[in-house]
């Protein structure tokens, strides 16, 4: 089995995790994709997934998680906004391809969220305009319950993560099911 590696990202409460998962667009452009958390001794749990079939660049939001699948680019973007300490954990992107096992990432994201808002700009945001306009209408796609406990050996999509700047404005107007609660229960 292929050894899964992980990258550690240390963020402050309130910041945004921004992950870009590359995939072969000819193979997986319209496939359903998901963002999962992996807890010790448990099977991966799906927190959010794209629609089936996945819609091009159409944002899907579940709580504070936003997925955007860019078919033209072979890129799934995952954002977790207004991070909380309890969001800390191990995450991964997967591509569902039934009846085969999910197509998983080598690089998992080890997210560590600490208390206190950083006054130092994050490494990936330098815009003069950086307003995250979270859609007021939340699209919640039905996610398959099945996730394989086994590691796949085929070449997976690739992923990396960004940390947004502390001065990024998160506009939560008219959003009813965002924050105040952990991403998962």
């Amino acid at each position: 089995a292929t050894k899964l590696t992980e990258e550690k990202y240390e963020l402050k409460e309130g910041q945004t995790l921004d992950v870009k998962c590359d995939y072969t667009l000819e193979k997986f452009a319209s496939s359903q994709k998901a963002w999962q958390i992996i807890r010790d001794g448990e099977m991966p749990k799906t927190l959010a997934c794209t629609e089936r079939p996945s819609k091009n660049s159409h944002p899907v939001q579940v709580g504070r998680i936003i997925l955007e699948d860019y078919h033209d680019h072979g890129l799934l973007r995952v954002r977790m906004v207004n991070l909380q300490v309890e969001d800390s954990g191990l995450y991964q992107c997967v591509i569902y391809q039934p009846p085969k096992e999910p197509h998983m990432l080598f690089d998992r994201i080890r997210l560590v969220v600490t208390k206190g808002f950083s006054g130092t700009p994050g490494s990936n945001e330098n815009s003069t305009q950086n307003v995250y306009k979270i859609p007021p209408t939340t699209t919640k796609a039905l996610c398959p319950l099945y996730t394989s406990p086994r590691t796949v050996t085929q070449a997976p999509p690739k992923s990396t993560a960004d940390v947004s700047t502390p001065d990024s404005e998160i506009n939560l107007t008219n959003v009813t099911d965002i924050i105040r609660v952990p991403v998962f229960n």
Partner: antibody, heavy 116, light 107 residues
């Protein structure tokens, strides 16, 4: 077929302004991030700015912040770069590119020369 | 800012031979790395993304590998049309940054 056609380049004096435009066709413009990348004569590639589909996220390289403004008109399938307070070091071929992180399609570029 | 360093600056190779180009990042970019080819007087063309995924229409002789800070672009058997300048680019963090380029010339 994806087509990106830049216009608006030319000779301008230091401190002057130019507005570059890019006409896009052959793909769903309103579903794509767009960017500008430049290349000084005989030099390498430099990213300038990126803009999300709905302009809710915009990013610039530090050297142009406060001087350049990227914008888009999804109704007209067009991308723009307003360049003010131009400097000699802004002299380059400016490419309109499809994508916000990596760049799948490129225009042929428009040359901007800043010189007195 | 993540600094991308390419080596060598110039690579002299005979047609039919293998070419190996290197790209190093000043900090980890995981697999968010792309390779471009640029011929004189032309715009760049995307070859590889996700460090190892070939872009649409790119011949199989082009392959990418690496993760983290060390990356390689390999052209298994150079064709005449492959002589050009090659750039790597990271897209993990803004500002997006390119390497200085490697010129692949005919030996």
């Amino acid at each position: 077929e994806v087509q990106l056609v830049e216009s608006g380049g030319g000779l301008v004096q230091p401190g002057g302004s130019l507005r570059l435009s890019c006409a896009a066709s052959g793909f769903t413009f309103s579903s794509n991030w767009m960017s500008w990348v430049r290349q000084a004569p005989g030099k390498g590639l430099d990213w300038v700015a990126s803009i999300k589909q709905d302009a809710s996220e915009i990013y610039y390289v530090e050297s142009v912040k406060g001087r350049f403004t990227i914008s888009r008109d999804n109704a007209k399938n067009s991308l723009h770069l307003q360049m003010n307070s131009l400097r000699a070091e802004d002299t380059a071929v400016y490419y309109c590119v499809r994508g916000g992180w990596r760049f799948e399609s490129w225009g042929q570029g428009t040359l901007v020369t800043v010189s007195s | 800012e993540i600094v991308m360093t390419q080596s060598p600056a110039t690579l002299s190779v005979s047609p039919g031979e293998r070419a190996t180009l290197s790209c190093r990042a000043s900090q980890s970019v995981s697999s968010n790395l792309a390779w471009y080819q640029q011929k004189p007087g032309q715009a760049p063309r995307l070859l590889i993304y996700g460090a190892s995924i070939r872009a649409t229409g790119i011949p199989a002789r082009f392959s990418g590998s690496g993760s983290g800070t060390e990356f390689t672009l390999t052209i298994s058997s150079l064709q005449s049309e492959d002589f050009a300048v090659y750039y790597c680019q990271q897209y993990k963090n803004f500002p997006l940054t390119f390497g200085g380029g490697t010129k692949v010339e005919i030996k």
